[in-house]
Interface confidence: low
């Protein structure tokens, strides 16, 4: 006869090792008994359990409550023990010895692979503000055994690199993914992806990106010179910018204080019917966490009265 | 379905110091990473600190220094020490954790008030 077992057995953690010893005898021959044991451990084999044929199942004292025989219908010939609730010191090597009538002993080894999926983390890196050169946007740990493979998906155009700490048991691969920020990039999703044959599918955590921002500001509403005219009613001046977070205006009026009757509202500044004490220079000034913009204008309420022309001059400062 | 009840909010004067503790229910499946986040009045909510299975941890700029995260992996539970409050820690303080299953799922608990007088 002879006994078929299997060179590894892999599972997962947390799961149930069957661990298969089936003896193929020839007609009339019996299985008395057999022994499994630990065949790695430092100090000689370590017994897990003895199935028995007539006393039925021993199991060490190490082991209780760990090992069982596999659920009826059994054959007599099967010696398969199944290791409840594997961990990852259960990992390696096992011996499946068998004593048999009347042909005498043999014993085979198997390798016991624990697999032990990933938890990855994502922890996003400092602050991004356009204008800064390549910076962290997120490093993505994932510790497991085996090594676990880390990999990032985005359309988002960057650098990526890893690195990996081995244990006793497991390794872990951190990897980091550098990017220059640009206003583009925000809200666009940075997704880690660990990859495991532990697991049944890749395991995906998405960080959105935010990068601070703040664009030139500029002023709309001069664009015709002609409707800035004395008694002219509805008109107005818009602050024009974008930003991340978003932005607020402030309007004030540089040779002066605003003149009465015009309303700030929030990027607008409104007038009443106009009047020549609305002429001057407006000033639009823009900001948020990130930073501040300036942009003014020249007012110039034209009289029809007299004979001058209407001057606008448009100036940006950041 | 995993329930976060935070706890350890309150009062303190600047300079003083709170505990904030968070308790996740038993679940079959190991919280992956479970931390803090804060919302002032009339602001976004915000990154506090976050704590890995395995014990890493991660903080933001504002705090980093002054508050210290810990967890105790057995009963799912996260806690912030905050040493050294300022006015600007004032908001409520949110935990959060992710369960890892064949995908993350984040939960969040409904919040507890840390104020800082000056």
């Known amino acids: 006869g002879e006994l078929e077992t299997s060179d590894v057995v892999t599972v997962v953690l947390g799961q149930d090792a069957k661990l298969p010893c089936f003896y193929r005898g020839d007609s009339g021959e019996q299985v008395g008994q057999v022994a499994w044991a630990r065949a790695d451990a430092g100090e000689g084999a370590q017994e897990l359990a003895l199935l028995h044929s007539k006393y039925g199942l021993h199991v060490s004292p190490a082991y209780e409550g760990r090992v069982e025989q596999p659920p009826p219908p059994r054959n007599p010939l099967d010696g398969s023990v199944l290791l409840r609730n594997a961990v990852q010191a259960d990992e390696g090597e096992y011996e499946c010895r068998v004593s048999t009538f009347p042909a005498g002993s043999f014993q085979a080894r198997l390798r016991l692979r624990v697999l032990v999926p990933p938890l990855p983390s994502l922890n996003p890196g400092p602050a991004l503000e356009e204008g800064q050169g390549l910076t962290l946007a997120a490093s993505c740990t994932a510790e497991g055994s085996p090594a676990p493979s880390v990999t990032w998906d985005t359309e988002v155009k960057g650098t990526t690199s890893s690195r990996s700490f081995k244990h006793s048991r497991s390794a872990a691969v951190t990897s980091e993914f550098h990017l220059v920020p640009s206003r583009s990039m925000n809200g666009q999703p940075l997704t880690c992806v660990v990859s495991h044959p532990g697991l049944l599918q890749d395991q995906r955590i998405t960080h959105i990106l935010h990068v601070s921002f703040l664009a030139e500001a500029s002023v709309r509403g001069l664009e015709d010179q002609n409707l800035w005219h004395v008694g002219r009613e509805g008109a107005m001046l818009k602050c024009l910018s974008e930003g991340q977070p978003p932005p607020s205006y402030n309007w004030t009026r540089l040779d002066g204080p605003l003149p009465s009757g015009v309303r700030v509202d929030g990027d607008t500044l409104g007038f009443p019917p106009l009047t020549t004490e609305h002429s001057g220079i407006y000033v639009c000034h823009v900001s948020n966490e990130f930073s501040s913009r300036d942009s003014q204008v020249t007012v110039d309420v034209l009289d029809p009265q007299e004979d001058s022309g209407k001057q606008v001059d448009l100036v940006s400062a950041s | 379905e995993v329930q976060l009840v935070e706890s350890g909010g309150g009062l303190v004067q600047a300079g003083g110091s709170l505990r904030l503790s968070c308790a996740a229910s038993?679940?079959?499946?190991?919280?992956?990473?479970m931390g803090w986040y804060r919302q002032a009045p009339g602001k976004q909510r915000e990154y506090v600190a976050t704590i890995t299975t395995g014990g890493s941890t991660n903080y933001a700029d504002s705090v980093r220094g002054r508050f210290t995260i810990s967890r105790d992996n057995a009963e799912d539970t996260v806690y912030l020490q905050m040493n050294s409050l300022k006015p600007e820690d004032t908001a409520v303080y949110y935990c959060t954790a992710e369960l890892v299953r064949r995908g993350p799922t984040t939960y969040w608990g409904r919040g507890t008030q840390v104020t800082v007088s000056s």
């Open positions: 038993r679940s079959t499946f190991s919280l992956n990473i």
